[in-house]
């Protein structure tokens, strides 16, 4: 789950579960910083605006990132 705060990492738990790119409203990738030493990936779902913290090390999530970036590159001129 994500918690909003000004310091430390945002994600309290992370999920390995694959997410359907079509059901994604937004995908935030937060790089490591002075507050949090690792990458954080927060998916906002279209349904109810539900959010999930995703495990950047998970194969399913790596595949999701590839699919999303491929989709983006298709859209950009």
């Amino acid at each position: 789950i994500p918690l909003s705060r000004t310091v430390r990492c945002t994600c309290i738990s992370i999920s390995n579960q694959p997410v359907n790119p079509r059901s994604l409203e937004k995908l935030e990738i937060i790089p490591p910083s002075q507050f949090c030493p690792h990458v954080e990936i927060i998916a906002t779902m279209k349904k109810k605006g539900e959010k999930r913290c995703l495990n950047p090390e998970s194969k399913a999530i790596k595949n999701l990132l590839k699919a999303v970036s491929k989709e983006r590159s298709k859209r950009s001129p």
Partner: antibody, heavy 121, light 109 residues
């Protein structure tokens, strides 16, 4: 199956210390935030502390801040609660619980059976 | 800190009847952050409802949750003998503490 087993409870004098443990199995412990929740005899549930999956984030109830420390060892699939300067009002059943990782906040979906701490002189 | 109030304190009903339990927050709670738990004597709590209205895995459909803002409701459409227990609501705001309500005891009339 998914399981949490607490241990380390007992009878302790006021001002002394105790360390509770919670052994996790059947799920990816290193992905899950973990909570301690307590219940005084005949009373309701009181949230005590939370630690993030990676041990970076720690949060405490005001009633235990500065006295209790939550920690975890992901290599051992174990959660801990170090309780110092214990008071009579800390007497309770202490539960560890898993923070459901599949959503924004889906509650505490797995609970241990609890371990009893009695603070008495 | 958000304070949760549950009413009634005790609800005396017969099996087959409908139970309506209320949880009121001292300030607005995102519905994503409201959960309900059931606890029977000598047992650990069990998650029933999350996100104010979604049933947790394995929870029968006679349990339903509703509400938003400061007012939330847990409804048990037809009480089964195993439903007599204490029910707690819990909020999980954008930062701790993650408070529980004081509980509602549903007992047999």
């Amino acid at each position: 199956q998914v399981q949490l087993v607490e241990s380390g409870g007992g009878v302790v004098q006021p001002g002394r210390s105790l360390r509770l443990s919670c052994a996790a199995s059947g799920f990816t412990f290193s992905n899950s935030g973990m909570h301690w929740v307590r219940q005084a005899p005949g009373k309701g549930l009181e949230w005590v502390a939370l630690i993030g999956f990676d041990g970076i984030n720690e949060y405490y109830a005001d009633s235990v801040k500065g006295r209790f420390t939550i920690s975890r060892d992901n290599s051992k699939n174990t959660l801990y609660l170090q309780m110092n300067s214990l008071r009579a009002e800390d007497t309770a059943v202490y539960y560890c619980a898993r923070d459901w990782p599949e959503g924004y906040y889906n509650g505490m979906d797995v609970w241990g059976q609890g371990t009893t701490v009695t603070v008495s002189s | 800190e958000i304070v949760l109030t549950q009413s009634p304190g005790t609800l005396s009903l017969s099996p087959g009847e409908r139970a309506t339990l209320s949880c009121r927050a001292s300030q607005s709670v995102s519905s994503s952050y409201l959960a309900w738990y059931q606890q029977k004597p000598g047992q650990a709590p069990r998650l029933l409802i999350y996100g104010a209205s979604s049933r947790a895995t394995g929870i029968p459909d006679r349990f339903s949750g509703s509400g938003s803002g400061t007012d939330f409701t847990l409804t048990i459409s037809r009480l089964e003998p195993e439903d007599f227990a204490v029910y707690y609501c819990q909020q999980y705001g954008s930062s701790p503490p993650f408070t529980f309500g004081p509980g509602t005891k549903v007992d047999i009339k």
